[in-house]
Interface confidence: medium
Amino acid sequence: AQNITARIGEPLVLKCKGAPKKPPQRLEWKLNTGRTEAWKVLSPQGGGPWDSVARVLPNGSLFLPAVGIQDEGIFRCQAMNRNGKETKSNYRVRVYQIPGKPEIVDSASELTAGVPNKVGTCVSEGSYPAGTLSWHLDGKPLVPNEKGVSVKEQTRRHPETGLFTLQSELMVTPARGGDPRPTFSCSFSPGLPRHRALRTAPIQPRVWEPVPLEEVQLVVEPEGGAVAPGGTVTLTCEVPAQPSPQIHWMKDGVPLPLPPSPVLILPEIGPQDQGTYSCVATHSSHGPQESRAVSISIIEPGEEGPTAGSVGGSGLGTLALA
């Protein structure tokens, strides 16, 4: 079968090879698409509701005035010329829609070195097939789950149009001493070949480095941060500095509005408690200093918990990721 790609909403003409140029013609088109159950036969006589979707032209070609997602499938024509010679045409039709230019929303203007940060969310609307979103740092592809890079993806389909909306949220952990002004961009790659990728405008957040002080230690009980549902997790922030600084807590990079305390207790753990926790020590004489981040997770009975609750990895590209 010959592969045909057609843009959604555009007209499509499929030639019926071997058919006489004008009536009378002995030909029939058979369709197996999202609009049909098994095979649908169309003849040059036409007529009926199918004419608005597909009709046979006087020259024997099949005309679809506006291709839709339901028109994906197999189209076959069987024609006999004046001498009784039979010719078959076979097409596989796939449709596509190029989305609008992707955009980065909720982008961070500043990232903190040494801790996970949300860079932004890349959004592409109106594609078919879905396609993919990928992130780039200084023009080089970022690989999820490597070197402090994590990506959360979501694909939604419009209930009426059938077109896809893609979302991709990028989290990175910039290393201390890395690029102070990294350039991030996101690109949409179509699901069908031969169409070039669409790239967002780049964003250039600043990387802020906390003042290095004596290390802030975050101790997790139970060790590893994995706990059965309903259990209790105790996080203790140990700071060697004197006088004792104020200790505040973060979850998934967001400050927890709680009274300052060197101990954070999570009783009766539930799914909403899962996430990445860290503590921030604020000294009167220096800026804030953040601990390593620990991952708190729920283990179902019989599961083995992680051996360590620390989050992180090693360098990446020009933006070293901790």
Epitope: K251, L256, P259, S261, V263, I265, P267, Q272
Partner: antibody, heavy 120, light 111 residues
Framework: QVQLQQSGAELVRPGTSVKVSCKAS????????IEWVKQRPGQGLEWIGM????????NYNEKFKGKATLTADKSSSTAYMQLSSLTSDDSAVYFC?????????????WGAGTTVTVSS | DIVLTQSPASLAVSLGQRATISCRAS??????????MHWYQQKPGQPPKLLIY???HLESGVPARFSGSGSGTDFSLNIHPVEEEDAATYYC?????????FGGGTKLEIK
């Protein structure tokens, strides 16, 4: 079962102070926050502040800074709220409630309330 | 401070029908995939009682006829079917940032 038992009603003179208590039982007192809420007769609810009984750390609603002082005694599992320089505007029911730490931050157990009446 | 506006201020609903109470925040109370909006029920002479936490999670022991929904700035509490014992004042409360604030309350009367 989990309970917060508040002290009884108070009738006090303007310009004086009052200390309301909230005794916790049935759970680990230092594992949760104690939050305080004000409700004037026939009115809605106003958050006063919260205390971490484990560390003694507090957060106050700006509106109640200087008016309310929150403390906690771990040995007796009791939280206290002192209200100073009382005026008729302070006449209300005061509730203590248990607050989740972490990021939930809702009030899952409430005391029955302490009525404070300021009158000369 | 985040202002929570509840509507209506009062409503009367027939037994077995649906009651819907709205709560609108002056700015978003959602972040990191969570909506920090909670709902309480208060009957005269009693303390408030937690019904729904984090916008849609039913507190244990609360009947399944109570449900919550919404995100960002717009939230609602639904009660269906309404029962006699549901006559009370309902409050929304956010915990997105300090200070926590409550809505003005909605008084539900059963017809």
């Amino acid at each position: 079962q989990v309970q917060l038992q508040q002290s009884g009603a108070e009738l006090v003179r303007p310009g004086t102070s009052v200390k309301v208590s909230c005794k916790a039982s049935g759970y680990a007192f230092t594992n949760y926050l104690i939050e305080w809420v004000k409700q004037r007769p026939g009115q809605g609810l106003e958050w006063i502040g919260m205390i971490n009984p484990g560390s003694g750390g507090t957060n106050y609603n700006e509106k109640f800074k200087g008016k309310a002082t929150l403390t906690a005694d771990k040995s007796s599992s009791t939280a206290y709220m002192q209200l100073s320089s009382l005026t008729s505007d302070d006449s209300a029911v005061y509730f203590c409630a248990r607050g989740r730490g972490g990021h939930y931050r809702y009030f899952d157990v409430w005391g029955a309330g302490t009525t404070v009446t300021v009158s000369s | 401070d985040i202002v929570l506006t509840q509507s209506p201020a009062s409503l009367a609903v027939s037994l077995g029908q649906r009651a819907t109470i709205s709560c609108r925040a002056s700015k978003s109370v959602s972040t990191s995939g969570y909506s920090y909006m909670h709902w309480y029920q208060q009957k005269p002479g009693q303390p408030p009682k937690l019904l729904i936490y984090l916008a849609s999670h039913l507190e244990s022991g609360v009947p399944a006829r109570f449900s919550g929904s919404g995100s960002g700035t717009d939230f609602s509490l639904n009660i269906h079917p309404v029962e006699e014992e549901d006559a009370a004042t309902y409050y929304c409360q956010h915990s997105r940032e300090l200070p926590w604030t409550f809505g003005g309350g909605t008084k539900l009367e059963i017809k």
